[in-house]
């Protein structure tokens, strides 16, 4: 039960995260005009990955796409690439994880296959989240650098007679959406990887030997291991109580060398 919940929650958290990454990528407010300590203008500028916008105090908003590809800064291109890679990996991860969900039965798919798919989607979510966080962080770093550069020469002009105010940009809402979404996708991926450990069926290479002790009937299984999923051999003896009901989810409750957190 715990594994199903972990897997389901991981899926939902990742889904929200990827939706957030897509939203952040499409948003126009990656950088917004800094209003603090700046001359007050009746025009508000903000920029996204794909276009820049201007909102007048009249309410009229005009957005212009970046129609050039070669003329754009390399950093912006890199951020775009990171976000797109994050979305693509996340989308594939979602697709894989849907089939890996324990609550969904597809033909005679074995638990070991579901475990593999869960692990695959988990890794994809982790990489997707990292791509988004990296992309947003690169953009934020670019903004900070430009901010201080434009602050240093905020007013330029000929002999101080005519002043040109340079527009300074600060963090836009999309950056925060991106960071949160990337974090959620990462957490979802970790949860999927954790769930994967409890999904694969327990297998043994020899039959358990029964020892009849007074009182309870207890079977000891020395040195059982998971061959199918490539997990390391279990050095702990695991007691199996004949009398107690046990769910599938409780099978892999001991730690292995493939702990992802």
């Amino acid at each position: 039960m715990a594994v199903t919940a972990c897997q389901g929650l991981g899926f939902v958290v990742s889904l929200i995260g990827i939706a957030g990454i897509i939203a952040a990528t499409c948003m126009d407010q990656w950088s917004t005009q800094d209003l603090y300590n700046n001359p007050v203008t009746a025009v508000f500028n903000y920029q996204g990955l794909w276009r820049s916008c201007v909102r007048e105090s009249s309410g009229f908003t005009e957005c212009r796409g970046y129609f050039t590809l070669l003329g754009l800064p390399a950093m912006l291109q890199a951020v775009r690439a990171l976000m797109i890679v994050g979305i693509v990996l996340g989308a594939i991860g979602l697709l894989v994880s849907i089939f890996a969900l324990k609550c969904i039965r597809i033909g005679s798919m074995e638990d070991s296959a579901k475990a593999n798919m869960t692990l695959t989607s988990g890794i994809m979510f982790i990489v997707s989240g990292l791509c988004a966080i990296a992309g947003v962080s690169v953009f934020a770093n670019m903004l900070v650098t430009n901010f201080w550069m434009s602050t240093a020469n905020m007013y330029t002009g000929m002999g101080g007679m005519v002043q040109t105010v340079q527009t300074r940009y600060t963090f836009g809402a999309a950056l925060f959406v991106g960071w949160v979404a990337g974090g959620l996708t990462l957490i979802g991926g970790v949860m999927m990887c954790i769930a994967c450990r409890g999904l694969a069926p327990e297998e043994t290479n020899y039959k358990a030997v029964s020892y009849h002790a007074s009182g309870h009937s207890v079977a000891y299984k020395p040195g059982g291991f998971k061959a199918s999923t490539g997990f390391g051999s279990n050095t702990k003896n695991k007691k199996i109580y004949d009398g107690g009901a046990r769910t599938e989810d409780e099978v892999q409750s001991y730690p292995s060398k493939h702990d992802y957190v």
Epitope: P39, A42, V43, N45, S58, V162, T164, V165, Q166
Partner: antibody, heavy 118, light 113 residues
Framework: QVQLQQPGTELVKPGASVKLSCKAS????????MHWVKQRPGQGLEWIGN????????NHNEKFKSKATLTVDKSSSTAYMQLSSLTSEDSAVYYC???????????WGHGTLVTVSA | DVVMTQSPSSLTVTAGEKVTMSCKSS????????????LTWYQQKPGQPPKLLLY???TRESGVPDRFTGSGSGTDFTLTISSVQAEDLAVYYC?????????FGSGTKLEIK
Amino acid sequence: QVQLQQPGTELVKPGASVKLSCKASGYTFTSYWMHWVKQRPGQGLEWIGNIHPSNGGSNHNEKFKSKATLTVDKSSSTAYMQLSSLTSEDSAVYYCAPIYYGNSLAYWGHGTLVTVSA
Amino acid sequence: DVVMTQSPSSLTVTAGEKVTMSCKSSQSLLNSGNQKNYLTWYQQKPGQPPKLLLYWASTRESGVPDRFTGSGSGTDFTLTISSVQAEDLAVYYCQNSYFYPFTFGSGTKLEIK
């Protein structure tokens, strides 16, 4: 079409206050900043300030900050400007005008002539 | 505050003549975000409220005759009337519509001979 109704004249005594009104129609009143402009007889135009009817946010010309108070009544689509401690310097025509493309003022009221006289 | 300087203060021309008037601002009115100049031109006839002629320095308001054209960028702007008509007798104001407080030029009075 956009219409801005302003009373024609206001005669007030020095030191007194006056509240000028500007009733707007023909557009969504709460969506656009309302600007106020002063023009003394035979002189140029002076921007007093503006107010956003939806939230009451405003911008003022520092020169008029203690002189003019801008308010709105959304229910009647009316903008108000209260002028306090009036002197002969405040005798002028006061116009209201909502913001337009390019932050310009395309529609103007006919103006209220305020005369400060003992 | 942004200072708007208009010149000349008055002009006397004959009908049909071409007229140019200048407006200079103490700060650039060019917005880098959309490459638009936030300068507005108004015409005020005696006893009337001002009338919008041009916004964004060169965009003609609907209903304004095409003899009125605006040009310039940054801090230097020009209003040109290609062929002055009798009804163009008025005071022409330029306005900074970029920085608060919005400021107007002192005006150019156009008189017809």
